[in-house]
């Protein structure tokens, strides 16, 4: 058993049929010694008396808010949550496996630049009685500070018969060094509590591996005289790290016909313009990627040929 | 060339070669998403590689003030990785095919380090740890880890030379 926060405790249980459970001793936070009784949740049934209460925690029915009273007055509370371990593996019932980039990916994170700011998100089908808390650091043995905000519900989607909820959190490394080569990964830890179930999820990454630039901005076409060719130009996204002579991007320019089956013409360039042939009813799209490190491509910025 | 007197390197040549290094480092070890390197009792085997750190002057301001600190750091790293790529970790089994990008990568690391340091001038280099794996699969693990950290190292080096070529070239 360990303390998650003041008056909230997590009991770690091996979860299998007829498991013996864990013996837990609760102590009433009071100078009083006599006349103390204990109840669980809203029930008025007295579970025991005395300054300490010993319970055998085996299942969710044994978890909840234990309260010690004296003469109708509440003295203190202890909330017990359960953390299940099945076949040596901690349960992951609360969050959905996003399966990208690999199985057992519960947290996904992205950064728009090298400033040390990043966003993580996760999915669940649970709509109520759900809380999250997020901690992060650079490295684990001698951790350096990363400050995370509160997790918020950022999207709701309908998937078949189910509703899916996306939560996200923004974090910022306290003393980021954008030009340095990271040697210690960022660690992100999410505590999830649903009713009386506790779970924790972790992710470890380098900012360089989660970089995904915003799409190029101000995408414009300039027809070239007496030609089907156009000059496409664009700019670095505002959110990208500066100076651009140091934090350089590379670009992919694509000409795509109306039909998805039509052949796509692609050009790669380090410049912020390119000359392409504009077909009727086609669109021109541009996306960006770090020039020197193969992290994710941005989403496409597009304009119609016409 | 970065010579003892502190004169400028051939920024544009360094830029071109460092960008080539980036391409080679990624072709030698593309992102293999289904490989879980942590599964193999992942002791930190590549902790001793030289990293370009915050105080090494490789940021735009540091380069403007005095690029020599940064160039020395990059040179150290290039020599270190060149030695690693020429060691038993990469020459042993399972053997890399002759057309593997690792061969070109090895030669390009040497080429860039020579551009930075002409014959006759010696910056001190970092000792290469003796990592001789007893099992061939450990060699494979080390290769992947070394190439991953090399990708990060050459990315920073390429940014330095691109910025130098754009802003510090005479």
């Amino acid at each position: 058993i360990w303390e998650l926060k003041k008056d909230v405790y997590v009991v770690e249980l091996d979860w299998y049929p007829d498991a013996p459970g864990e013996m837990v001793v609760l102590t009433c936070d009071t100078p009083e010694e006599d006349g103390i009784t204990w109840t669980l949740d809203q029930s008025s049934e007295v579970l025991g008396s005395g300054k300490t209460l010993t319970i055998q925690v085996k299942e969710f029915g044994d978890a909840g808010q234990y309260t010690c009273h004296k003469g109708g007055e509440v003295l203190s509370h202890s909330l017990l949550l359960l953390h299940k371990k099945e076949d040596g593996i901690w349960s992951t019932d609360i969050l959905k496996d996003q399966k990208e980039p690999k199985n057992k990916t519960f947290l996904r994170c992205e950064a728009k630049n090298y400033s040390g700011r990043f966003t993580c998100w996760w999915l669940t089908t649970i709509s109520t009685d759900l809380t999250f808390s997020v901690k992060s650091s650079r490295g684990s043995s001698d951790p350096q500070g990363v400050t995370c905000g509160a997790a918020t519900l950022s999207a709701e989607r309908v998937r078949g018969d189910n509703k899916e909820y996306e939560y996200s959190v923004e974090c910022q490394e306290d003393s980021a060094c954008p030009a340095a080569e990271e040697s210690l990964p960022i660690e992100v830890m999410v505590d999830a509590v649903h009713k009386l179930k506790y779970e924790n999820y972790t992710s470890s990454f380098f900012i360089r591996d989660i970089i995904k630039p915003d799409p190029p901005k101000n995408l414009q076409l300039k027809p070239l005289k007496n030609s089907r060719q156009v000059e496409v130009s664009w700019e670095y996204p505002d959110t990208w790290s500066t100076p651009h002579s140091y934090f350089s991007l590379t670009f992919c320019v694509q000409v795509q016909g109306k039909s998805k089956r039509e052949k796509k013409d692609r050009v790669f360039t380090d410049k912020t313009s390119a000359t392409v042939i504009c077909r009727k009813n086609a669109s021109i799209s541009v996306r960006a990627q770090d020039r020197y490190y193969s992290s994710s491509w941005s989403e496409w910025a597009s304009v119609p040929c016409s | 060339r970065a010579v003892p007197g502190g004169s400028s390197p051939a920024w544009t040549q360094c830029q071109q070669l460092s960008q080539k290094l980036c391409t080679l480092a990624w072709s030698a070890h593309p992102l293999v998403g289904h490989m879980d390197l942590r599964e193999e009792g992942d002791e930190e085997t590549t902790n001793d590689v030289p990293h370009i750190q915050c105080g090494d002057g490789c940021d735009p301001q540091g380069l403007r003030d005095n690029s020599q600190f940064c160039l020395q750091r990059i040179h150290q790293g290039l020599i270190f990785y060149e030695k690693l790529l020429g060691s038993d970790i990469f020459t042993g089994e399972p053997s890399l095919l002759p057309d593997s990008p690792v061969g070109q990568l090895h030669a390009s690391l040497l080429g860039l380090s020579q551009l930075l340091q002409p014959e006759g001038h010696h910056w001190e280099t970092q000792q290469i740890p003796s990592l001789s794996p007893s099992q061939p699969w450990q060699r494979l693990l080390l290769r992947f880890k070394i190439l991953r950290s090399l990708q990060a190292f050459v990315a920073v080096a390429a940014r330095v030379f691109a910025h130098g070529a754009a802003t510090l070239s005479p």
């Epitope: - | 099992q135 699969w137 494979l140």
Partner: antibody, heavy 126, light 111 residues
Framework: QVQLVQSGAEVKKPGSSVKVSCKAS????????ITWVRQAPGQGLEWMGE????????YYNEKFKGRVTITADKSTSTAYMELSSLRSEDTAVYYC???????????????????WGQGTLVTVSS | DIVMTQSPDSLAVSLGERATINCKAS???????????LHWYQQKPGQPPKLIYN??KLESGVPDRFSGSGSGTDFTLTISSLQAEDVAVYYC?????????FGGGTKVEIK
């Protein structure tokens, strides 16, 4: 075509040594390793060790506790396996096999004993 | 050393029927979760062994009635429709850790 031709059968006394040769032809000798595997009469296969002429690396089965020495002569494309302090339980057919052990982006860990010698019967008897 | 345990020791199957051979390693012989360092060899009487399955890949020239599966510690070689020429002893071999080790062999016969 690829061929591995082993030296002939040997009868040895306990405590003595035997040196079996394996001459390779039909491929670039230094691009592959040579593995030695033995098979006692009516028994299974036992890996003894392998040598890679290009890297100079040799891997041994510690079970043989320094009794086995595997070498290669690049000039004649011949591999050798010497087993010392022979005992009756060393009676077996000794095979050499070409070992391809490569790493590519597509196949990061490809290992094949793809061509085998005809085998050399070594009999240890007093 | 990694111990490779094959089962059954011998197997009699009718022509055209399926034959399944198992190989269990005393510790994982996959690398990075996905690369198999487990191989299958076929040995006919009086001949040296012949490679039939390399990691997760059927060797070229080997009929596609042979298939290999498994990961971690448990592996299987399946002959979907046994032919007369498949009568042999089959060995698994791990080359994750030196010393490389063979299984004890499974003799496949026609019932």
């Amino acid at each position: 075509q690829v061929q591995l031709v082993q030296s002939g059968a040997e009868v040895k006394k306990p405590g003595s040594s035997v040196k079996v040769s394996c001459k390779a032809s039909g491929y670039t000798f230094t691009s592959y390793g040579i593995t030695w595997v033995r098979q006692a009469p009516g028994q299974g296969l036992e890996w003894m060790g392998e040598n890679y002429p290009r890297s100079g690396n040799t891997y041994y089965n510690e079970k043989f506790k320094g009794r086995v020495t595997i070498t290669a002569d690049k000039s004649t494309s011949t591999a050798y396996m010497e087993l010392s302090s022979l005992r009756s339980e060393d009676t077996a057919v000794y095979y050499c096999a070409r070992a391809e052990f490569i790493s590519t982006v597509v196949a990061p860990y490809y290992y094949a004993l793809d061509y085998w010698g005809q085998g050399t019967l070594v009999t240890v008897s007093s | 050393d990694i111990v490779m345990t094959q089962s059954p020791d011998s197997l009699a199957v009718s022509l055209g029927e399926r034959a399944t051979i198992n190989c269990k390693a005393s510790k994982k012989v996959t690398i990075f979760g996905s690369i198999s360092a487990l191989h299958w060899y076929q040995q006919k009487p009086g001949q040296p062994p012949k490679l039939i399955y390399n990691g997760a890949k059927l060797e070229s020239g080997v009929p596609d009635r042979f298939s290999g599966s498994g990961s971690g510690t448990d592996f299987t070689l399946t002959i979907s429709s046994l032919q007369a020429e498949d009568v042999a002893v089959y060995y698994c071999l791990q080359n994750k850790e030196v010393p490389y080790t063979f299984g004890g062999g499974t003799k496949v016969e026609i019932k």
